[in-house]
């Protein structure tokens, strides 16, 4: 007996050929012999089956010898070992239909978990072996569960349901809710002005919710609320703002902030949160703010940052294309009677300059000069 | 709804080989037959053959000896190429799905063939 | 190959008139016929198949009826968005063949 394996809501041919490469009369039974089609010359007959609505052939090919079943939008239940009568023979053929299907909402928060439920007919035994995005590969039974999400697990799951030596093959889209980077470090020099982006790692239709900045500054003994805004079909509207600092807020995705001056005061780490409407639990997104400070005073040259630094990070005083005069991992460094001439204060990692200030230091009769 | 998006090189020379794809989207794949049909001023609708999921092809016997058609079930698609064209090939080709009626099309790729 | 002919090639009508347009094929095709409509620019669309039955989403105005070798699509009361050119195509045996279409223009 010939096993086809079909998909839940798919279309499946199941084929019955005769030795006679005309149009001649054939019947499709099911397993209590109920007609579902046949024909009557050329005309195609249907029985009183239940997939009277959902059964079809191809008149095309009768003149072939082939007298095919194509049954639309599979059912669980259309399961069953389906007879061809053709030239006083009978060929069997068992369709076993499954269905995959993810167990919740496809759109995921970062860090939840997946569940996939295979429905199939009863009797079968079939295994199912699924690949991520990234190559991870999960087998199970009846349900596959994948914890922890990353964002590396958006995109085309593809699931192979194993019955009888035959495969079926299911795609199932998966996005995995996050912003694009789980961190990330803003260098600024004191008085810019301060860009805070945070991408989306994923593009819906509608996106509703509300968000909310947490600001944790380095000279602060507890963390305050910066701002809360809602998100209404991809608008941003403001709900509340501190009055200092007088965070703006963009319209428009991707969430961006702007902080007027970069200051000491406000150097430190923040923790945007997102809640979006029908979802438990909130994407979040760190993002710190390192700030720098280059000062004179009498003869005492200076350079101090504030904020969360790496301690493999070098700040260093130098006077314009010369030798480092100072270099420390520290988070100040100064210079005693500097000599004239544009001093550069640097932050820097392994080599790369991440922040830089440059100071004009005049001879000792005048006032230093802060470009 | 089952979407269909097709390409393919829009201006050819005499003698060269057209070739088109198709992408199915949003539907089952298995089970249809996934056709190509041109339309020219000239000759109205043509249809030129079909393929199925297995690979099993029906053409026109009128274009038989320069049409291929074939099918990547990794990615839902399916191709035509028509060898040695001529000027008389000229005309907006369509993909379409089929089982007995053409119930989904996709949305037309002119092609021109000129020296 | 089964050869359809389409009549009239154009008719010119007003809204709210009741049209008739006939296809013909060389041989009995039983009832493997289908009727499309097609609007400038864009593909054929499916109105009718197995001679009568309607695709879903198509208005109740239009009808087909006809067997063997006779065919026939009835729009009951023209709407201004109904004139565009129609196709009958058979689906008895390869090829399939189409209808030369009649174009339905506003008188």
């Known amino acids: 007996k010939k096993v086809v394996l079909g998909k839940k809501g798919d279309t499946v041919e199941l084929t019955c050929t005769a030795s006679q490469k005309k149009s001649i009369q054939f019947h499709w039974k099911n397993s209590n012999q109920i007609k579902i089609l046949g024909n009557q010359g050329s005309f195609l007959t249907k029985g009183p089956s239940k997939l009277n609505d959902r059964a079809d052939s191809r008149r095309s090919l009768w003149d072939q010898g082939n007298f095919p079943l194509i049954i639309k939008n599979l059912k669980i239940e259309d399961s069953d070992t389906y007879i061809c009568e053709v030239e006083d023979q009978k060929e069997e053929v068992q369709l076993l239909v499954f269905g995959l299907t993810a167990n919740s909402d496809t759109h995921l928060l970062q860090g939840q978990s997946l569940t996939l439920t295979l429905e199939s007919p009863p009797g079968s035994s079939p295994s199912v072996q699924c690949r991520s995005p990234r190559g991870k590969n999960i087998q199970g039974g009846k349900t596959l569960s994948v914890s922890q999400l990353e964002l590396q697990d958006s995109g085309t799951w593809t699931c192979t349901v194993l019955q009888n030596q035959k495969k079926v093959e299911f795609k199932i889209d998966i996005v995995v809710l996050a912003f694009q980077k789980a961190s990330s470090i803003v260098y600024k020099k004191e008085g810019e002005q301060v860009e805070f982006s945070f991408p989306l790692a994923f593009t819906v239709e509608k996106l509703t919710g509300s968000g909310e900045l947490w600001w944790q500054a380095e000279r602060a003994s507890s963390s305050k609320s910066w701002i809360t805004f809602d998100l209404k079909n991809k608008e941003v509207s403001v709900k509340r703002v501190t009055q200092d600092p007088k965070l703006q807020m963009g319209k428009k995705l991707p969430l961006h902030l702007t902080l007027p001056q970069a200051l000491p005061q406000y150097a430190g780490s923040g923790n945007l949160t997102l809640a979006l409407e029908a979802k438990t639990g909130k994407l979040h997104q760190e993002v710190n703010l390192v700030v720098m400070r280059a000062t004179q005073l009498q003869k005492n040259l200076t350079c101090e940052v504030w904020g969360p630094t790496s301690p493999k990070l070098m700040l260093s005083l130098k006077l314009e294309n010369k030798e480092a005069k100072v270099s420390k991992r520290e988070k100040a460094v100064w210079v005693l009677n500097p000599e004239a001439g544009m001093w550069q204060c640097l932050l820097s990692d392994s080599g790369q300059v991440l922040l830089e200030s440059n100071i004009k230091v005049l001879p000792t009769w005048s006032t230093p000069v802060q470009p | 709804q089952v979407q269909l998006q097709q390409w393919g090189a829009g201006l050819l020379k005499p003698s060269e080989t057209l070739s088109l794809t198709c992408a199915v989207y949003?539907?089952?794949?298995?089970?249809?037959?996934w056709s190509w049909i041109r339309q020219s001023p000239g000759k109205g609708l043509e249809w030129i053959g079909e393929i199925n999921q297995s690979g099993s092809t029906n053409y026109n016997p009128s274009l038989k000896s320069r049409v291929t058609i074939s099918v990547d079930t990794s990615k839902d698609q399916f191709s035509l190429k028509l060898s040695s064209v001529t000027a008389a090939d000229t005309a907006v080709y369509y993909c379409a799905r089929v089982i007995n009626w053409f119930d989904s099309w996709g949305q037309g790729s002119l092609v021109t063939v000129s020296s | 190959d089964i050869q359809m002919t389409q009549s009239p090639s154009s008719v010119s009508a007003s809204v709210g008139d009741r049209v008739t347009i006939t296809c013909r094929a060389s041989q009995g095709i039983s009832s493997w016929l289908a009727w499309y409509q097609q609007k400038p620019g864009n593909a054929p669309k499916l109105l009718i198949y197995?001679?009568?039955s309607f695709q879903s989403g198509v208005p109740s105005r239009f009808s087909g009826s006809g067997s063997g070798t006779d065919f026939t699509l009835t729009i009951s009361s023209l709407q201004t968005e109904d004139f565009a050119t129609y196709y009958c195509?058979?689906?008895?045996?390869?090829?399939?063949?189409f209808g030369q279409g009649t174009k339905l223009e506003i008188k």
């Open positions: 949003g539907g089952s794949f298995s089970g249809y037959y």
């Open positions: 195509q058979q689906a008895n045996s390869f090829p399939y063949t």
């Open positions: 197995d001679a009568s």
